[in-house]
Amino acid sequence: NFMYSKTVKRLSKLREYQQYHPSLTCVMEGKDIEDWSCCPTPWTSFQSSCYFISTGMQSWTKSQKNCSVMGADLVVINTREEQDFIIQNLKRNSSYFLGLSDPGGRRHWQWVDQTPYNENVTFWHSGEPNNLDERCAIINFRSSEEWGWNDIHCHVPQKSICKMKKIYI
C-alpha cells in the first residue's frame, strides 16, 4: 500500500514536468531506494542542479525566456567547482550567456534568481567588466586565461546555459 501510494505520487510529479520534459534521466540518491533525483534528458547534472547548453543564438532576454519556458533560468554560478563542471560541456570558440546582468549600467550586477552577487566568487577575465554599455555577462575562452566572464551588449545573440534544480521523485 505504501509503495503503491509512493508510485502514484511519483507518477503525478512526473506528469507535472512532462509538458516541458518528456524524458527524464533519474539516479538513485544515497542508499534509499525510495529517493531518486532526475534531470531532463539530455541535460547534465552536478550536485543538486541540472544544466542545458542551448546552442541556438539569442539575445540575453530571449535566452532567459527560453530557459524559463523549460522551468529553468540562465545559469547562476556559485562556486569554482560548479564553473569547472560547466566548462567541460562548452566549446572554446563559442560564448554563452550567464544569468548575470547589470540592467541599470551602474555596475550593480545581479543574478536572475536573486542570489546575492558576491565579488569574491566571480570569474571575470582580467580587465573585465570594462564597459558600462555592456550590461550582460557571458562565459568564454581566452587562450591566455582559459575560461572566464566578459561583459557584452545584451542584444547580441549568443549561445546560453540553462540551470534548474534537480527533480526529486
Epitope: 532576454t61 564597459n131 554599455d133 555592456e134 550590461r135
Partner: antibody, heavy 121, light 111 residues
Framework: EVQLLESGGGLVQPGGSLRLSCAAS????????MSWVRQAPGKRLEWVAT????????YYPDSVKGRFTISRDNSKNTLYLQMNSLRAEDTAVYYC??????????????WGQGTTVTVSS | DIVMTQSPDSLAVSLGERATINCKAS??????????VNWYQQKPGQPPKLLIY???NLESGVPDRFSGSGSGTDFTLTISSLQAEDVAVYYC?????????FGGGTKVEIK
C-alpha cells in the same frame, strides 16, 4: 552641441572598396558605443555595424558580415567603416549614430547628416 | 530576425487633429516590464531623430504631443495635435535582439 560628420562616400564600381569616416565633437567620444546605419533610396533604415567604446567588440548583420569592418580611433574622435566587395545593393546614405543603452536594449540618439555611397558600373 | 511591420504606409491628417501610427513586431520585444521599441522621425533630407524610446518614454526636448504606447508585439505612436512641422516619415525600431530592425516607415502629411 553634439556633432557627427560623415565623409568618404562616393561612386564606386561593384567589387570595389570605400572607407567612410565619422568625426565626432561635443561628446566624450571614447565613452560611446557607436553604430553605422544605412538607408537605400526609398527603403527602410538598416543597421550596418556597431563597435563598443574600447573598440574590442564589433557586431554586424549577416548582410555585411565579412565585407564591412567598423573601427575607431578614440585619440582622433573618429569612427570608420571599411567597406570591401561592394555590391549594387550597398548603395545608400550611410549615417553614423551614437548608441545609448536602455536596460537590456538601446537607442540611437544622435545621428550625423549622412554620406552617400553609390555602387554602380 | 524580428520583422517590424508598420501601418498605414501613409497618413493624411488635418492640422490640430490626432495622428496614429501602428507597429507590429513578429515576436515579443518585452522583458521584465520594458518594451524594446523606439520611434524616430525623419524629415526630407535630414537624418532620423529619436522621439520615443522603450515604447513610451519621451526623449528629452521632444514636444509632449508625441506619445508612445504598447507592449509585447503591438505598439503605437500618437501625435495628439498635428502641427505643420510634424510632416515627416516615422519609423519604429526594435533593439531587443540583433540585428536591430526598423519598420518600413509611415509618411505623415497634412490633409
Amino acid at each position: 552641441e553634439v556633432q557627427l560628420l560623415e565623409s568618404g562616400g562616393g561612386l564606386v564600381q561593384p567589387g570595389g572598396s570605400l572607407r567612410l569616416s565619422c568625426a565626432a565633437s561635443g561628446i566624450t567620444f571614447s565613452t560611446y558605443t557607436m553604430s553605422w546605419v544605412r538607408q537605400a533610396p526609398g527603403k527602410r533604415l538598416e543597421w550596418v555595424a556597431t563597435i563598443n567604446s574600447g573598440g574590442d567588440n564589433t557586431y554586424y548583420p549577416d548582410s555585411v558580415k565579412g565585407r564591412f569592418t567598423i573601427s575607431r580611433d578614440n585619440s582622433k574622435n573618429t569612427l570608420y567603416l571599411q567597406m570591401n566587395s561592394l555590391r549594387a545593393e550597398d548603395t545608400a546614405v550611410y549615417y553614423c549614430a551614437t548608441y545609448r543603452p536602455y536596460y537590456y536594449g538601446s537607442v540611437l540618439d544622435y545621428w550625423g547628416q549622412g554620406t552617400t555611397v553609390t555602387v554602380s558600373s | 530576425d524580428i520583422v517590424m511591420t508598420q501601418s498605414p504606409d501613409s497618413l493624411a491628417v488635418s492640422l490640430g487633429e490626432r495622428a496614429t501610427i501602428n507597429c507590429k513586431a513578429s515576436q515579443s520585444v518585452d522583458y521584465d516590464g520594458n518594451s524594446y521599441v523606439n520611434w524616430y522621425q525623419q524629415k526630407p533630407g535630414q537624418p532620423p531623430k529619436l522621439l520615443i524610446y522603450g515604447a513610451s518614454n519621451l526623449e528629452s526636448g521632444v514636444p509632449d504631443r508625441f506619445s508612445g504606447s504598447g507592449s509585447g508585439t503591438d505598439f503605437t505612436l500618437t501625435i495628439s495635435s498635428l502641427q505643420a512641422e510634424d510632416v515627416a516619415v516615422y519609423y519604429c525600431q526594435q533593439s531587443d535582439e540583433d540585428p536591430w530592425t526598423f519598420g518600413g516607415g509611415t509618411k505623415v502629411e497634412i490633409k
